[in-house]
């Protein structure tokens, strides 16, 4: 008889989760020479150990410590790109601008990007049926705690000028409740980070407003300035042109504003 299993409100663990994580790790270490020393079996053991056999509403950042330790990686100063509610464009940007890095360009972010996972208390099984939803069930679930943990570490280790891409089409361009607003902003280290530069991405082609004057951007500026980090803001009026100009900076049309 199938044993009783807790029903959560969120979707279950991504199909073939262990195989996916291991395969992503192998691929990543093959492509990134500085990570070739990483033992992907150990990385999977650490990932698994963070949530297997544990009640999935009682996961802590400490549970992920072995994984964070094994996946430690360095980002050069001035090369960190944070993002909020505009993941696809941020990733398109770093795919072109290969010397800049989002969290998902790092090993741990790459392993977990777009995946869901959870286990069950006192069994070694992975729950493929359902996992806790952040709102409806609990915030201390395996996926949410993972992203909070690695986002904190990513922000803590940033240095120089840090960039953040923000979605100008949202009602709250800067959202204090986003991972960027609740975790990353507060873990930038003033002794290492000289400035935060926000890129506000416009949605409409005819949108010529200065979204850097938006009240939520002013709120971000205030938070950052109070932490003794300088703040700059730029409007990206034409994201398509912006990407094109990153690819081909010599293009004559790129000499005018984007």
């Amino acid at each position: 008889l199938p044993r009783w299993r807790q029903q959560w409100s969120g979707s279950g663990t991504t199909s073939r989760f262990p195989e996916t994580v291991l395969a992503r790790c192998v691929k990543y270490t093959e492509v990134h020479p500085e990570m070739r020393h990483v033992d992907c079996q150990s990385v999977w053991d650490a990932f698994k150990g963070a949530f297997i056999s544990k009640y999935p509403c009682n996961i802590t950042e400490e549970d992920y410590q072995p994984l964070v330790k094994l996946g430690t990686q360095t980002v050069p100063c001035n090369k960190t790109l944070l993002w909020s509610r505009i993941k696809d464009l941020a990733h398109q940007f770093t795919q072109v601008q290969r010397d800049m890095f989002t969290l998902e360009d790092m090993l741990l972010g790459y392993l977990a990007d777009d995946l869901t996972w959870c286990g069950e208390f006192n069994t070694f099984e992975i729950n493929y049926q359902s996992c806790p939803d952040w709102r409806k069930d609990c915030s201390n679930n395996p996926v949410s705690v993972f992203w909070k943990t690695v986002s904190r570490r990513f922000a803590e280790t940033a240095c120089g000028v840090v960039h953040v891409m923000l979605n100008g089409s949202r009602s709250k361009i800067f959202d204090k409740n986003s991972t960027f607003g609740s975790v990353e902003v507060h873990n930038l280290q003033p002794e290492k980070v000289q400035a935060l530069e926000a890129w506000v991405i416009h949605g409409g082609r005819e949108d010529s407003r200065d979204l850097c004057q938006d009240p939520t951007i002013k709120e971000l500026e205030s938070i950052i300035s109070k932490r003794n980090i300088r703040f700059f803001c730029k409007n990206i009026y034409r994201p398509d042109k912006f990407l094109q100009c990153v690819k081909n900076p010599e293009d004559s049309s790129c000499l005018s504003g984007i």
Epitope: E34, D39, S42, D45, A46, G49, Q65, L70, T157
Partner: antibody, heavy 117, light 107 residues
Framework: QVQLQQSGAELVRPGTSVKMSCKAA????????IEWVKQRPGHGLEWIGD????????DYNEKFKGKATLTADTSSSTAYMQLSSLTSEDSAIYYC??????????WGQGTSVTVSS | DIQMNQSPSSLSASLGDTITITCHAS??????LGWYQQKPGNIPKLLIY???NLHTGVPSRFSGSGSGTGFTLTISSLQPEDIATYYC?????????FGGGTKLEIK
């Protein structure tokens, strides 16, 4: 082969500071954590903290925060530990070791610190 | 902090014997356990990492097992050069902690 060469023994006065070194060879220094461990007779082994030379990231045992400061110089593949406000309790052998799978796979020969007036 | 309770604290055995040292963690440490050998006047040396993996150059008479909270180090066919103190160490959470050590003597 992996080697960690530590600086020589130190005899220091109470209240002063000491800085010891750990020079790595035989592997990519920036890719592995360097662990620091204290050993006193009858007290076993105590983990002080570690540093990831590639980014200068550090983690400390709460007990040694304010006592130990870990740094690294990637140009010379050398890790350093400074101990401040020394007392007789700090008399010990201090080891550096390379981190591997959350264990310590290669150890330096140790630096003996004696605090005495 | 995670406590690592090692037993016995001392052990006397004959050459050729098989001996077992145990290490109990005060909370789950998964497989993140290392075993070290320290001969008198020498530096600690890694024997086993990740609970059961033999470190490079370590004789196969050393073996490790366990996961979660209970771990064992087994030395089969005891040799004179095995006289040493053995330590376990957890790497699951900060601060990393060591067991109190097991001093092995030959009868």
């Amino acid at each position: 082969q992996v080697q960690l060469q530590q600086s020589g023994a130190e005899l220091v006065r109470p209240g002063t500071s000491v800085k010891m070194s750990c020079k790595a060879a035989g592997y990519t220094f920036t890719n592995h954590w360097i662990e620091w461990v204290k050993q006193r007779p009858g007290h076993g082994l105590e983990w002080i903290g570690d540093i990831f030379p590639g980014g200068g990231y550090t983690d400390y045992n709460e007990k040694f925060k304010g006592k130990a400061t870990l740094t690294a110089d990637t140009s010379s593949s050398t890790a350093y530990m400074q101990l401040s406000s020394l007392t007789s309790e700090d008399s010990a052998i201090y080891y550096c070791a390379r981190g591997r799978d959350l264990a310590m796979d290669y150890w330096g020969q140790g630096t003996s610190v004696t605090v005495s007036s | 902090d995670i406590q690592m309770n090692q037993s016995p604290s001392s052990l006397s055995a004959s050459l050729g014997d098989t001996i077992t040292i145990t290490c109990h963690a005060s909370q789950n440490i998964n497989v993140w356990l290392g075993w070290y050998q320290q001969k008198p006047g020498n530096i600690p040396k890694l024997l086993i990492y990740k609970a059961s993996n033999l470190h490079t150059g370590v004789p196969s008479r050393f073996s490790g097992s366990g996961s979660g909270t209970g771990f064992t180090l087994t030395i089969s066919s005891l040799q004179p050069e095995d006289i040493a103190t053995y330590y376990c160490q957890q790497g699951q959470s900060y601060p990393y902690t060591f067991g109190g050590g097991t001093k092995l003597e030959i009868k």
